[in-house]
Amino acid sequence: SGLNDIFEAQKIEWHEVPRWRQQWSGPGTTKRFPETVLARCVKYTEIHPEMRHVDCQSVWDAFKGAFISKHPCNITEEDYQPLMKLGTQTVPCNKILLWSRIKDLAHQFTQVQRDMFTLEDTLLGYLADDLTWCGEFNTSKINYQSCPDWRKDCSNNPVSVFWKTVSRRFAEAACDVVHVMLNGSRSKIFDKNSTFGSVEVHNLQPEKVQTLEAWVIHGGREDSRDLCQDPTIKELESIISKRNIQFSCKNIYRPDKFLQCVKNPEDSSCTSEI
């Protein structure tokens, strides 16, 4: 019923932008975007007691205010400030798991290890996960046809700026030992151009963060190489060390077994290296 009240209160009609309008290279706004964001907000705040006082209508007002009527190539972090404020969330700062190019396994891990958090386990990350959105300059319409692509059109688009902003805040809030899950199957295990490499690494606070521990996830069953010696991991170690943060690295040779052992740490096979 709370959700119905919110839908009733909507003042803007969400028309599609006509097809003759500007065409971008990326997919358009996710279908039923306003309803999806509101529904996710209501669900999240019902489940998480520390966010129960958050008003989802205000959250949606702040979200839409960040991109509606604005040119989708001219979005700034400042546009998202009200949303960031309403979505401020105190997660245990020593239980943060960052990830790069291996989202699914990171999420499977935090679903089992419930006291650890990825960005998508927070309200703001949960609201926007896997969604696309953009508007149009000087109209109150959402563009369901196309949205700017980061490479082909512009980097300051609503989705990219959102993730940059929320990722920076998430990294800034971290403390003690921060973990990052990296994909060992990729040519660049650590990619300076990823959100982790370009935003999160540079916003960890040395006065709060003691160590960044990388977990390199192996893809092949027979892959016994020490991927912690990979040149890109050495590059990450160098960046982190220069920021006066300690660095450590672990190979996760068997991600399936790794998850199984997180679920059942008493299992006798879990004492050997995973």
Epitope: E78, L86, T90
Partner: antibody, heavy 121, light 110 residues
Framework: EVQLLESGGGLVQPGGSLRLSCAAS????????IIWIRQAPGKGLEWVAA?????????YYADWAKGRFTVSKDNSKNTVYLQMNSLRAEDTAVYYC???????????????WGQGTLVTV | DIQLTQSPSTLSASVGDRVTITCRSS????????LAWYQQKPGKAPKLLMY???NLASGVPSRFSGSGSGTEFTLTISSVQPDDFATYYC??????????FGGGTKVEIK
């Protein structure tokens, strides 16, 4: 110079209503959160409500203020309002408006305050 | 509800004394360090002294310092000056953008 000036306080009967004003000058009004904070006589500080109006109004409230208190803004007058209904004796306090520090690393703190206006119920 | 507990509630000191005020939060503040300190004199509005637990606000003398993280914080005045006799409040920032203030510590002349 940044200035915030509250007005509209006074004596009101229990169950009555009052509208407080906070007139701002010396800064770009739309780019800051304005927060209402109150202080009962001889007591500590308590936040009431917050508003930000870059395009539309975005506002939120302390749990205890929801339903009875409403914050609004008139950008043409550079003024924020606090409408207080169903007032009780425990609402007696000096009501301050304050401007939050600007910038992502500084939100959550109040750098500029008005002189306050006393509401007696 | 979030509670911020300050101690002591009153503190008597002489000019030149070192003074420490403690603030405990019932929940961790945002980012582990999103806590501010304010000074208030009778009949005046509060004035920001410290933000993010240990950062001095503009124009605040260096005899003021702050420390702590998570739920426990302290404000220290290394050598109390006549202008420092006032009431001090801590203020935390929490989930959903909410705020809470401590009950205050009055620093008076011994």
């Amino acid at each position: 110079e940044v200035q915030l000036l509250e007005s509209g306080g006074g004596l009101v009967q229990p169950g009555g209503s009052l509208r407080l004003s906070c007139a701002a000058s010396g800064f770009s009004f739309n780019n800051y959160w304005i927060i209402w904070i109150r202080q009962a006589p001889g007591k500590g500080l308590e936040w009431v409500a917050a508003i930000y109006s870059p395009s539309g109004d975005i506002k939120y409230y302390a749990d205890w203020a929801k339903g009875r208190f409403t914050v609004s803004k008139d950008n043409s007058k550079n003024t924020v309002y606090l409408q207080m209904n169903s007032l009780r004796a425990e609402d007696t306090a000096v009501y301050y408006c304050a401007r939050e520090l600007s910038g992502a690393s500084y939100e959550g703190y109040f750098e500029s305050w008005g002189q306050g206006t006393l509401v007696t119920v | 509800d979030i509670q911020l507990t300050q101690s002591p509630s009153t503190l008597s000191a002489s000019v030149g004394d070192r003074v420490t005020i403690t603030c405990r939060s019932s929940q961790s503040v945002y980012g582990h360090n999103w806590l501010a300190w304010y000074q208030q004199k009778p009949g005046k509005a509060p004035k920001l002294l410290m933000y993010r637990a240990s950062n001095l606000a503009s124009g605040v003398p260096s005899r003021f310092s702050g420390s702590g993280s998570g739920t426990e914080f302290t404000l220290t005045i290394s050598s109390v000056q006549p202008d420092d006799f006032a009431t001090y409040y801590c203020q935390g920032y929490y989930s959903g953008g909410s705020y809470a203030f401590g009950g205050g510590t009055k620093v008076e002349i011994k």
